[in-house]
Amino acid sequence: QLSRAGRSAPLAAGCPDRCEPARCPPQPEHCEGGRARDACGCCEVCGAPEGAACGLQEGPCGEGLQCVVPFGVPASATVRRRAQAGLCVCASSEPVCGSDANTYANLCQLRAASRRSERLHRPPVIVLQRGACGQGQEDPNSLRHKYNFIADVVEKIAPAVVHIELFRKLPFSKREVPVASGSGFIVSEDGLIVTNAHVVTNKHRVKVELKNGATYEAKIKDVDEKADIALIKIDHQGKLPVLLLGRSSELRPGEFVVAIGSPFSLQNTVTTGIVSTTQRGGKELGLRNSDMDYIQTDAIINYGNSGGPLVNLDGEVIGINTLKVTAGISFAIPSDKIKKFLTESHDRQAKGKAITKKKYIGIRMMSLTSSKAKELKDRHRDFPDVISGAYIIEVIPDTPAEAGGLKENDVIISINGQSVVSANDVSDVIKRESTLNMVVRRGNEDIMITVIPEEIDP
């Protein structure tokens, strides 16, 4: 038995002091509007369906419905005493997706459909998600909506990230087969794409696939092998989505960054992290040409996203994903370098202007500090017992460094009798000297190596 205090309906005139369920009239098996309690809150009755009249003598609205009089005022005892009728309106107004894959205008319509389904001895219709079927939940107040800033960035930039595939010729049949793939990003609406030079190496045939699946043959417009930047072009009718270049010089250590690539057609790979070091000490990572700087990040950069953009939370490109040195250490070519390359490329193509030569040996290197040496030693048991010098990350094929016998993981400890403490020391000597007599620590032996720098276009 219910006391009045337990009643959910407002107290109406003529209600008994105590509810007696035995006095409740029998109810039909199925109610179109669902069940509700009578005005006294004593008996379960059939509620009026959505859109039906309520209040006065009409009885209560069904489950999830409320009685609203004209001008949207919910019905109350006062309203009823004023003898005004209302309409049953769903308390929830947002669309929902049912388990029958139908979108319902509101929860009440889904419940009505579920009751009809059960009447026909079919499974009930349950709510799968808020919002229309096939559409994400768009509640602007949800935590997902508020805090998924990484996903927001990805959604914004993904259309301008492309999948690049390279084809090689078989030696005798000359048939083309896919040999490698990487990523790139569109920088002009007419189809200019930036990627790593190493992604489009060796004049392979280059095919570009956009996010929508459209594929194009690409022409290599310009390559700076030393900076590892390439510009390729596709011929596309209409405007393409583009990414804007941010200012890498304004990056701060600790800033969130997102590395995105397209390693497989129609799919993106996303990794995220922070900026560990910005613009490593100007020449610190002495890659290929002396004024090269790098952004160091813990966002994972791998073959899948190599050539793709490293972006800030505004979706601006602050680097090209370029290489992974070892677990937790990845590097990106700063956007300021990309801007310089694009400007010079434009000038070269417009004017065919003369370029002053620079000296080059063909290594990627970084300064070795005692902490960096310890870190590398922990990862590689045979890492040399040194705490300073220039650590060789990579030796570029077909370069003076390779010809001289330098190898990855070597540490340059002296050149022409002068000790080498940092990557800067090596860059400085390359500028000055025409022959480099190096002492290199490899494993636990010191090796003498001679490298003759070559003059190259910057």
Partner: antibody, heavy 123, light 105 residues
Framework: QVQLVQSGAEVKKPGASVKVSCKAS????????MHWVRQAPGQRLEWMGA????????AYNQKFKGRVTITADKSASTAYMELSSLRSEDTAVYYC????????????????WGQGTLVTVSS | DIQMTQSPSSLSASVGDRVTITCSVS?????MYWYQQKPGKAPKLLIY???NLASGVPSRFSGSGSGTDFTFTISSLQPEDIATYYC????????FGQGTKLEIK
């Protein structure tokens, strides 16, 4: 992992033919050419020819032209080398080897080899 | 046809020695490749594109050179390095050097 498994040793009479098979696994058979290299006792390795398994296109060392036929069965991922008009100097170990490719430099080499098939030509 | 001359044809060295093998070609080639062959086994690629170490090959092996003259080096000979070594070029079609048989003193 990539594996090339060759058929067993053969003993043949001069003037006869021999057909050696090479079953490939662990990679897409049609993405690489298959080559045949032989090594006579105490001699250097000698390239005989190659096939593109996808198209059936072949290339042969002029020295063997007319005597060697290389074929492939895509469905079985198997390459075959047939050498006819055998003579005693054809006694050698015959290897199938996959053409490898250097992405960085664009050069070609042989990256995987079969275990070798000894063909003895004796009257 | 490109002629290949590999020297020496055989050599004997002690464990820990530095061993050098040379390969000369009759006309300039882009790259040289080096293989190791142990008795009764198939050749195994050691060096590709003149100086790149093949996967899983110890760093004591190295290669250098350009044009017509190329060098293969073992920085510190180990007992398991006893084998015959071949150079190979691939300009129009592949050809091999005559091999260098390496023995331990």
């Amino acid at each position: 992992q990539v594996q090339l498994v060759q058929s067993g040793a053969e003993v043949k009479k001069p003037g006869a033919s021999v057909k050696v098979s090479c079953k490939a696994s662990g990679y897409t058979f049609t993405d690489y050419e298959m080559h045949w290299v032989r090594q006579a006792p105490g001699q250097r390795l000698e390239w005989m020819g190659a096939i593109d398994p996808e198209t059936g296109g072949t290339a042969y060392n002029q020295k063997f032209k007319g005597r060697v036929t290389i074929t492939a069965d895509k469905s079985a991922s198997t390459a075959y080398m047939e050498l006819s008009s055998l003579r005693s100097e054809d006694t050698a170990v015959y290897y199938c080897t996959r053409e490898g490719y250097s992405y960085e430099g664009g050069g070609y080499y042989f990256d995987y080899w079969g275990q070798g098939t000894l063909v003895t030509v004796s009257s | 046809d490109i002629q290949m001359t590999q020297s020496p044809s055989s050599l004997s060295a002690s464990v820990g020695d530095r061993v050098t093998i040379t390969c000369s070609v009759s006309s300039s080639v882009s790259y040289m490749y080096w293989y190791q062959q142990k008795p009764g086994k198939a050749p195994k690629l050691l060096i590709y594109d003149t100086s790149n170490l093949a996967s899983g090959v110890p760093s004591r092996f190295s290669g250098s050179g350009s044009g017509t003259d190329f060098t293969f080096t073992i920085s510190s000979l180990q007992p398991e390095d006893i084998a015959t070594y071949y150079c190979q070029q691939w300009s129009y079609y592949p050809t091999f050097g005559q091999g260098t048989k390496l023995e331990i003193k």
